[in-house]
């Protein structure tokens, strides 16, 4: 069978080889498509409801005024010339529709290096067959599931037209110290060969590099955190970041009900004040960051305090946000 590719909505003429150029003709067209069950026979003297789909022209050719998805299938003509010689024509018709230019919607203007970011969603509407969407970074194809690249795809079919809408959401994790203005684009590749890809306009989000956080320092006075009963302990939370973050205090892992302050003074120490203290610095851009923990203890007169203080672990690092 001869392969024919026809655009949806366009007319199509299939020649009946060997047919006399004008009536009287002995010919018959048979079609097996999405509109037929088994074979439908159309003859030159036909004419009727099927004319809206396909009709035999005076020269014996079959005319389809506007090809549709349901016209995909096999078309056969059997003709006999004036001398009684029979000729058969056999066509396999496939249809296509090129969508409008794809677009990137919900695109990000800024990405953060080192963490997953949604770049945008590529949308293509009105294709047949469905075709595929692919993403490009600086002109080179992006491969999903490689180097922090992930793609979520969705295909929908219009209930009336049968045409496809494709959606592809791109997530990337930009490398630290990489290109500050990467160029992303998306392209639609048709499901049928010999049709060029359609590419979106590019987008160029900025990549923001988060400044690595310097550690929150907790300084205890007296050094080591051991103090005689009735003495005073001063805890100072030092944060290099600008602007100064809010400082809250924790004792034994529980927030203390105090107003934010970089200094915590414990006057007239008693047994109830013993425990492990830390401070939490809350940055508007980074979220909370906890210091190491220090242990405050009471020493009875005549006891030697610990030389370096009984210092706890390094804290929890950056707290996860609930």
């Amino acid at each position: 069978a001869q392969n024919i590719t026809a655009r949806i909505g366009e007319p199509l003429v299939l020649k009946c080889k060997g047919a006399p150029k004008k009536p009287p003709q002995r010919l018959e067209w048979k079609l097996n498509t999405g509109r037929t069950e088994a074979w439908k026979v159309l003859s030159p003297q036909g004419g009727g409801p099927w004319d809206s789909v396909a009709r035999v022209l005076p020269n014996g050719s079959l005319f389809l005024p506007a090809v549709g998805i349901q016209d995909e299938g096999i078309f056969r003509c059997q003709a006999m010339n004036r001398n009684g010689k029979e000729t058969k024509s056999n066509y396999r018709v496939r249809v296509y529709q090129i969508p409008g230019k794809p677009e990137i919607v919900d695109s990000a203007s800024e990405l953060t290096a080192g963490v997953p970011n949604k770049v945008g969603t590529c949308v293509s509407e009105g294709s047949y067959p469905a075709g595929t969407l692919s993403w490009h970074l600086d002109g080179k194809p992006l491969v999903p599931n490689e180097k922090g690249v992930s793609v979520k795809e969705q295909t929908r079919r219009h209930p009336e037209t049968g045409l496809f809408t494709l959606q592809s959401e791109l997530m990337v994790t930009p490398a630290r110290g990489g290109d500050p203005r990467p160029t992303f684009s998306c392209s639609f590749s048709p499901g049928l060969p010999r049709h060029r890809a359609l590419r979106t306009a590019p987008i160029q989000p900025r990549v923001w590099e988060p400044v690595p956080l310097e550690e929150v320092q907790l300084v205890v006075e007296p050094e080591g955190g051991a103090v005689a009963p009735g003495g005073t302990v001063t805890l100072t939370c030092e944060v290099p970041a600008q602007p100064s973050p809010q400082i809250h205090w924790m004792k034994d892992g529980v927030p203390l009900p105090l107003p934010p302050s970089p200094v915590l003074i414990l006057p007239e120490i008693g047994p109830q004040d013993q425990g492990t203290y830390s401070c939490v610095a809350t940055h508007s851009s980074h979220g909370p960051q906890e210091s190491r923990a220090v242990s405050i203890s009471i020493i009875e007169p005549g006891e030697e305090g610990p030389t370096a203080g009984s210092v706890g672990g390094s804290g929890l690092g950056t707290l996860a946000l609930a």
Partner: antibody
Framework: EVQLVESGGGLVQPGGSLRLSCAAS????????MTWVRQAPGKGLEWVAS????????YYPDSVKDRFTISRDNAKNSLYLQMNSLRAEDTAVYYC????????????WGQGTLVTVSS | DIQMTQSPSSLSASVGDRVTITCRAS??????VNWFQQKPGKAPRRLIY???NLADGVPSRFSGSRSGTDFTLTISSLQPEDFATYYC?????????FGGGTKVEIK
């Protein structure tokens, strides 16, 4: 909303003529075939004529061929039925309907207009 | 020309009954049969298109089926508003041919 409104019916003598009109709205008129169907009082439905979307091809049953002519004006979203040499048996309610082909078969109908052929 | 033989020409039924109406085509018409409902003084309304497809806005108690050249309209549970006349239509070939109609009356 698809709407089809017939007009032009009435009383006519045998041998006389009448022209029915159908005003279409709510859809792209020139994308569709159009059809006239009639129903004699107390009887069933009978196909009268169809026309393709361009107006180039028309179709009739033997009962009205050479007497009735279906036509359309796509610019005016209008369908017509010119009825000549009318007979008593043409008395019926005449309905205009969208479609009549393989793609869209009589999906929407008008409310009909009564044609009475009597002396 | 194709003939569409519709049966029965009338039937009496009660609300809640299952009703079946049949049309037989005199030759192969593929899937190209519609069913219509008509109430007195009103235009026909398409119920089923291409033998088995329910038209928009038509209750799911209506269904269509096909076996060769036999086409069936079924109302699974008759409702008061379903008392009307039903027609089949063949649109595979000209002349388009309607069945003779089936009048569904209250028992």
């Amino acid at each position: 909303e698809v709407q089809l409104v017939e007009s032009g019916g009435g009383l006519v003598q045998p041998g006389g003529s009448l022209r029915l009109s159908c005003a279409a709205s709510g859809f792209t008129f020139n994308n569709y075939w159009m059809t006239w169907v009639r129903q004699a009082p107390g009887k069933g439905l009978e196909w009268v004529a169809s026309i393709d979307n361009s107006g180039d091809n028309t179709y009739y049953p033997d009962s009205v061929k050479d007497r009735f002519t279906i036509s359309r004006d796509n610019a005016k979203n209008s369908l017509y039925l010119q009825m000549n040499s009318l007979r008593a048996e043409d008395t019926a309610v005449y309905y205009c309907a969208r479609g009549g082909d393989i793609l869209d078969s009589l999906h929407f109908w008008g409310q009909g207009t009564l044609v009475t052929v009597s002396s | 020309d194709i003939q569409m033989t519709q049966s029965p020409s009338s039937l009496s039924a009660s609300v809640g009954d299952r009703v079946t109406i049949t049309c037989r085509a005199s030759q192969d018409v593929g899937i190209y049969v519609n069913w219509f409902q008509q109430k007195p003084g009103k235009a026909p309304r398409r119920l089923i298109y291409r033998a088995t497809n329910l038209a928009d806005g038509v209750p799911s108690r209506f269904s269509g089926s096909r076996s060769g050249t036999d086409f069936t309209l079924t109302i699974s549970s008759l409702q008061p508003e379903d008392f009307a006349t039903y027609y089949c239509l063949e649109f595979d070939e000209h002349p388009l041919t309607f069945g003779g109609g089936t009048k569904v009356e209250i028992k």
